[in-house]
Interface confidence: low
């Protein structure tokens, strides 16, 4: 492992298409990829009138973006899919939404997702 | 009505530089992630580069990495993309092309391309 | 990355035939596939987004399904103006990558 990097090895797992898709609906999801590549955790959401659903959460390929991030925060102010990525085992488990430029609004999961 | 005007096209010889802008309207670009995808000639689509809404993620295909760098200029509506160190594979027509979200979603919205040959 | 493979590469048909074209990516990128027409010397369109969903302004006859690793693009009767070559791509992770294409052309 490199100093002071998390590394990845394991993240969690939800399809809210579970079904069409063939997956399980949650779970815990071991992360692969080239060696010479780093992995993440990542996770979308959406807020329908307050409430929390989530799209998916799983394992995410190596991107810079997501570089050295320990939690899982969306800045973007108001999308339609909150997207966020982070390093480190199950450091997708929770998430928030911390607009940039606006009062904090941070949504901490675990989160029942509502039945598919 | 969403527009995307791509401009900066032109014959370059190998190892120059270039910079192609789009200058968007019609939309709020300020919200919007903005993708660079090239076509050479006969050939089929490729992603080169995204931005995210404000710039502070950005991501390149493997092929242009280090060479180009994608920017925008939220106050000017414009994206931009500067291309270093040229080579003859580079030559395609450029598209720039919108997208919602940074991770998942499609490209709904297209320029009309501007052509870059390399070539000495 | 994540490899986009579309086939059939090109394929002849009449106006009012059902045309199926298929892409399959290397692993599963869930419903993270869009499709695109592209007619020459003009910008790619939109189609299909989200493995089923119809763009805006795209006509009922274009259907997309598929989730996990394969897809599907049909155009239930094709139309004079259908004639184009198509792409898939996921948006599943990036880099976006795309399918090869394949041409529709008049039998």
């Known amino acids: 492992a490199i100093l002071g990097r998390s590394e990845t090895q394991e993240c969690l797992f939800f399809n809210a298409n579970w079904e069409r898709d063939r997956t399980n609906q949650t779970g815990v999801e071991p992360c692969y990829g080239d060696k010479d590549k780093r992995r993440h955790c990542f996770a979308t959401w959406k807020n329908i009138s307050g409430s929390i659903e989530i799209v998916k959460q799983g394992c995410w390929l190596d991107d810079i973006n997501c570089y050295d991030r320990t939690d899982c925060i969306e800045k973007k102010d108001s999308p339609e899919v909150y997207f966020c990525c982070c390093e480190g085992n199950m450091c997708n488990e929770k998430f928030s939404y911390f607009p940039e430029m606006e009062v904090t609004q941070p949504t901490s999961n675990p989160v029942t997702p509502k039945p598919p | 009505e969403v527009q995307l005007l791509e401009s900066g096209g032109g014959l370059v010889q190998p190892g120059g530089s270039l910079r192609l802008s789009c200058a968007a309207s019609?939309?709020?670009?300020?919200?919007?992630?903005m993708n660079w995808v090239r076509q050479a000639p006969g050939k089929g689509l490729e992603w080169v580069a995204g931005?995210?809404?404000?710039?502070?993620?950005?991501s390149y295909a493997d092929s242009v990495k280090g060479r180009f760098t994608i920017s925008r200029d939220n106050s000017k509506n414009t994206l931009y993309l500067q291309m270093n160190s040229l080579r003859a594979e580079d030559t395609a027509v450029y598209y720039c092309?919108?997208?919602?979200?940074?991770?998942?979603?499609?490209?709904?919205?297209w320029g009309q391309g501007t052509l870059v040959t390399v070539s000495s | 990355d994540i490899q986009m493979t579309q086939s059939p590469s090109s394929l002849s048909a009449s106006v009012g035939d059902r045309v199926t074209i298929t892409c399959r990516a290397s692993?599963?990128?869930?419903?993270?596939v869009n499709w695109y027409q592209q007619k020459p010397g003009k910008a790619p369109k939109l189609v299909i987004y989200?493995?089923?969903s119809r763009a805006s302004g795209v006509p009922s006859r274009f259907s997309g399904s598929g989730s996990g690793t394969d897809f599907t693009l049909t155009i239930s009767s094709l139309q004079p103006e259908d004639f184009a070559t198509y792409y898939c791509?996921?948006?599943?992770?990036?880099?976006?990558?795309f399918g090869g294409g394949t041409k529709v052309e008049i039998k």
């Open positions: 092309a919108r997208s919602a979200n940074w991770h998942d979603t499609a490209l709904d919205y």
């Open positions: 019609g939309f709020t670009f300020s919200s919007y992630s």
């Open positions: 931005i995210n809404y404000n710039g502070g993620y950005t």
């Open positions: 692993q599963s990128i869930l419903s993270f």
């Open positions: 989200a493995a089923t």
């Open positions: 791509q996921q948006s599943y992770n990036l880099p976006l990558t």
